[in-house]
Interface confidence: medium
């Protein structure tokens, strides 16, 4: 740091004074010197370092007519809104010829009410769940002691623990306010008041109670909600893409969820209007007067297969001699699962019913007994999934084939010749 030489007497006739005050104070430091000849520029030092961007003004007054006469130079340094960074030792510095002169020091100090560096923030917490709040204050003067208040009531701190910058709250059962006071020798400052809103805990044990092709019954265990009763729970279901795999904690799925509200208790809900044999993900959150809990993780569930809701369509049965040609189309009604095949039943007026599993084909050729004298033959067809048979079609009478009548355009598959009416019952 620059030092004044002792070769000449110091030109300074007025040195900086001392300033001590609270944050935000505005003050001025002043130094005065008397020099012969052209007045020098006055620099300001803080703790020995030149202040490059000082808010200073310099006034020069000649004491004689000639430029070589003495001048009085006054430099004023303005400190606006005093901060901790402004504190330190201040001096004026001038260069005269080949010499450097430094004034006697003045001191700027900060002293006042505590100043908050960190204050408690508003937040939401689940009922009976631990959390921490932070508060930090500084002087000077130090030491600064912190006192926490809950709902305007001071919380006693364990002796010897000193200022508690972090307050550990083991859990709340009602929405509460927290603030902290900072105490020092100058007095007390109070922080902002943080509101801690108590929400219900996340529900637990979301599970399936029963499954049907188009509805799922689910239940869950509610979490604690403090002094605030739960008003309702909300259940969301979303179609799971193949391999979408909503993982626990992943962001919301891209599809618009199906949302249902459940009155509570009971903590159970029947979700209807679902697709059969379809994977879904479900989650639940419960709400009190203070707001909603967090959602549970997504639970993968699946509706079971159902039976087809309608019979095969456009059944046609035509007889030609000892053969009967039967063909049909897939049901228009929802299959509610994976189509595994068709069953066909036929019966004459005086003969027992014969049941056949056709598989996935949509046509069959039947070999009729003897000379084809089976009278009033009727045919029924039903589709089936893993869940069972769908409804049977209305009986279709076997029509005699007449010359000129068109044959079915698709390839008929001939059943192997076996004794009539020997098919097993299904």
């Amino acid at each position: 740091a620059p030092r004044g030489t002792q070769a000449e007497e110091s030109p300074f006739v007025g040195n900086p004074g001392n300033i001590t005050g609270a944050r935000g104070l505005t003050g001025t430091l002043r130094c005065q010197l008397q020099v012969q000849g052209e007045p020098p520029e006055v620099h300001w030092l803080r703790d020995g370092q030149i202040l490059e961007l000082a808010d200073s003004t310099q006034t020069q007054v000649p004491l004689g007519e000639d430029e070589q006469d003495d001048w009085i130079v006054v430099s004023q340094l303005r400190i606006t809104s005093l901060q901790l960074s402004d504190t330190g030792q201040y001096q004026c510095l001038v260069f005269l010829g080949h010499q450097t002169f430094v004034s006697q020091p003045g001191y700027v100090g900060l002293e006042g009410l505590p100043y908050f560096l960190e204050e408690p923030e508003d937040r939401t917490v689940a009922a009976n769940t631990p959390f921490n709040l932070s508060c930090q204050a500084q002087g000077p003067p130090e030491p600064v002691d912190l006192l926490w208040l809950q709902d305007a009531v001071p919380l006693a701190t364990a002796p010897g623990h000193g200022p508690q910058r972090s307050l550990h709250v083991p859990g709340l059962n009602k929405t509460s306010s927290f603030s902290c006071e900072a105490h020092n020798a100058k007095g007390v400052t109070t922080s902002r008041t943080a509101t801690i809103t108590v929400l219900p805990q996340q529900p637990r044990n979301l599970h399936l109670v029963s499954r049907q092709p188009t509805e799922l019954e689910v239940a869950w265990t509610p979490g604690l909600s403090g002094i605030y009763p739960l008003t309702h729970c909300t259940l969301q279901a979303v179609l799971s893409d193949d391999g979408m795999g909503i993982q626990a904690g992943e962001p919301d799925p891209p599809e618009e969820p199906l949302t249902s509200q459940a009155s509570v208790p009971p903590h159970q809900l029947r979700l209807g209007s679902l697709h059969p044999h379809t994977p879904y993900h479900i989650r639940v959150a419960c709400t009190s007067s203070q707001g909603p809990s967090s959602w549970t993780h997504w639970l993968p569930v699946e509706t079971p297969e159902g039976v087809p809701l309608g019979p095969p369509e456009n059944i046609s049965a035509t007889r030609n001699g000892s053969q009967a040609f039967v063909h049909w189309q897939e049901p228009r009604a929802p299959l509610q699962g994976t189509l595994l095949g068709y069953r066909l039943a036929y019966q004459g007026q005086d003969t027992p019913e014969v049941l056949m599993d056709i598989g996935l084909r949509q046509e069959v050729t039947l070999e009729l007994q003897g000379d084809g004298s089976v009278s009033n033959l009727t045919v029924c067809v039903a589709a089936y999934t893993a869940a069972g048979d769908g409804p049977w079609s209305l009986p279709v009478p076997l029509e005699a084939w007449r010359p000129g009548q068109a044959q079915p355009v698709h390839q008929l598959v001939k059943e192997p010749s076996t004794p009539a009416f020997s098919w097993p019952w299904w």
């Epitope: 208040l149 305007a152 009531v153 001071p154 603030s179 006071e181 007390v188």
Partner: nanobody, 118 residues
Framework: QVKLEESGGGLAQAGGSLRLSCAAS????????IGWFRQAPGKQRELVAA???????NYADSVKGRFTISRDNAKNTVYLQMNNLKPEDTAIYYC????????????WGQGTQVTVSS
């Protein structure tokens, strides 16, 4: 404005008892919470006990089971009953009130000296 005046301090033997009183005057309807602090020589000021207008009471761990804070709303007075006193209880005891509406409305008494000899 609220004025707080403490009394009841003095010299006590270890194991003995003292009862401090703090009488409030002025705009006392604005007081919600009132309590006692103490400051021993060379130590930080610490909360001893506090009471709000309901049934809430708080005590420093070091005085639990020995000190009791109570209020007589008719007399606008709060008491600190100190039993089984210990030498480390020696301090200046201050009464402190918090106003309703804003926690930063704070009032302090002048303090009363409690000295416990062994």
């Amino acid at each position: 404005q609220v004025k707080l005046e403490e009394s009841g301090g003095g010299l006590a033997q270890a194991g003995g008892s003292l009862r401090l009183s703090c009488a409030a005057s002025g705009s006392i309807s604005s007081i919600n919470t009132i309590g006692w602090f103490r400051q021993a020589p060379g130590k930080q000021r610490e909360l001893v006990a506090a009471s709000d207008s309901g049934a809430n009471r708080n005590y420093a761990d070091s005085v639990k089971g020995r000190f009791t804070i109570s209020r007589d709303n008719a007399k606008n007075t709060v008491y600190l009953q100190m039993n089984n006193l210990k030498p480390e209880d020696t301090a200046i005891y201050y009464c402190r009130a918090w106003g309703t509406g804003t926690i930063s409305t704070m009032y302090w008494g002048q303090g009363t000296q409690v000295t416990v000899s062994s």
